[in-house]
């Protein structure tokens, strides 16, 4: 069959809240995918299953099951959300994050996705790998792309 | 009931263009795959392309590509195939036909056929 | 691309007759889950193409059960068990297993 193509487009929002008592960081991050389907039959979407990483440390997980039918030479566009909590070990980030000295707060985010399709039955999974920037310091929704973080550590896709 | 009804015969010179049309009727015109064959005088079929009428994404066979540009309107329930630098090559009755999305049918209706003659 | 190639490229039938049509292709039509896009067509003169069986032997709507298809991986058979005459035309194979789709290069039922 003719491959399922998953392009991880970038972040659409985050948004932010805090415990000060904790020094924790709560992020709740929406990421979009571009599912195209190059086969002449149709296939099924049947979960997403993402994470997101900061200093090679996951700080959150999210899976969505039974998502959509996607028609034969067809594309959709599906939004996911991951909650991710940066606190613990990371909580020196609150400081950074809460400094009101500067406009932007980005931090690094690796953001990882599994995509699982189906077809009568049996299943293809692909997966994506980005670097995200995302500004822990305010709620922030961005132009498609815009997040983006150029590394020569991430590798090509 | 299920009908495509293509355009009439067109004649035209070499080196022009030449927009074939085929109208659907009866069935949901964005659940089926819209593909084109060819038949030149005394020979076989041969398939040129599709496209999904929904998402307008098309595949060619490598042999039409440049050649022909499929396209459709979803508000007419219309398909279009268009034909450019027309050769003598090009003189064949074409074909539009539908494949659902699920199953393993394959062009289970088609058109009457399209009728290209390139003249001078 | 897959070639399918077809056998006989033309049959001399009598009304009654029983025939058999073959369809080869360069690879097998089996995709990775299993199901095997191959169908077959009539095209009579001065009609449009229809089609009588996909996915390898199901009858399409319609279609009188003296035609049968059977085959697997590279290898396919159209029978015909009584001919009449509204059968004689040119019969195709196509694979639509493989993009691009590709077609047989048909089989004359004539007449004697």
């Known amino acids: 069959p003719r491959s399922i193509d998953v392009k991880y487009i970038g972040v659409k929002s985050a948004y932010v809240s805090y415990d000060v008592q904790k020094r924790t960081i709560y992020l709740n991050i929406t990421n979009t995918l571009n599912i195209t389907n190059n086969n002449y039959y149709s296939v099924e979407v049947e979960n997403i299953t993402a994470q997101v990483q900061f200093s090679k440390t996951v700080i959150g997980k999210a899976r969505l099951n039974n998502i959509t039918i996607i028609g034969p030479l067809d594309m959709k566009q599906i939004d996911y959300t991951v909650p991710t909590v940066i606190a613990e070990e990371m909580s020196y980030m609150y400081d950074f994050c809460t400094l009101i000295s500067i406009k932007v707060h980005n931090i690094v985010l690796m953001m990882q996705v599994t995509v699982t399709t189906t077809y009568f039955g049996h299943s293809e999974q692909i997966s994506q790998e980005r670097y995200q920037y995302v500004d822990c310091g305010r709620n922030t929704t961005y132009q498609l792309g815009q997040s983006e973080y150029l590394n020569v550590l991430q590798p090509q896709q | 009931q299920v009908q495509l009804q293509q355009s009439g015969a067109e004649l035209v010179r070499p080196g022009t263009s030449v927009r074939v049309s085929c109208k659907a009727s009866g069935y949901a015109f964005t659940n089926y795959l819209i593909e084109w064959i060819k038949q030149r005088p005394g020979q076989g079929l041969e398939w040129i392309g599709v496209?999904?009428?929904?998402?307008?994404?098309?595949d060619y066979s490598e042999k039409f590509k440049g050649k022909a540009r499929l396209t459709a309107d979803k508000s007419s329930s219309t398909a279009y195939m268009q034909l450019s630098s027309l050769t003598s090559d090009d003189s064949a009755v074409y074909f539009c036909?539908?494949?659902?999305?699920?199953?393993?049918?394959?062009?289970?209706?088609w058109g009457q056929g399209t009728t290209v003659t390139v003249s001078s | 691309d897959v070639v399918v190639t077809q056998t006989p490229l033309s049959l001399p039938v009598s009304f009654g007759d029983q025939v058999s049509i073959s369809c080869r292709s360069s690879?097998?039509?089996?995709?990775?889950?299993?199901?095997?896009?191959l169908s077959w067509y009539l095209h009579t003169p001065g009609q449009s193409p229809q089609l009588l069986i996909f996915g390898i032997s199901n009858r399409f709507s319609g279609v009188p059960d003296r035609f049968s298809g059977s085959g697997s991986g590279t290898d396919f058979t159209l029978k015909i068990s009584t001919i009449k005459p509204e059968d004689l035309g040119v019969y195709y194979c196509?694979?639509?297993?493989?993009?691009?789709?590709?077609f047989g290069g048909g089989t004359k039922l004539e007449m004697k």
């Open positions: 496209i999904n009428p929904g998402s307008g994404i098309t």
């Open positions: 690879q097998s039509l089996a995709n990775t889950y299993g199901n095997t896009y």
């Open positions: 036909t539908r494949s659902p999305f699920i199953t393993t049918v394959v062009a289970d209706y």
């Open positions: 196509l694979q639509g297993t493989h993009p691009p789709r590709t």
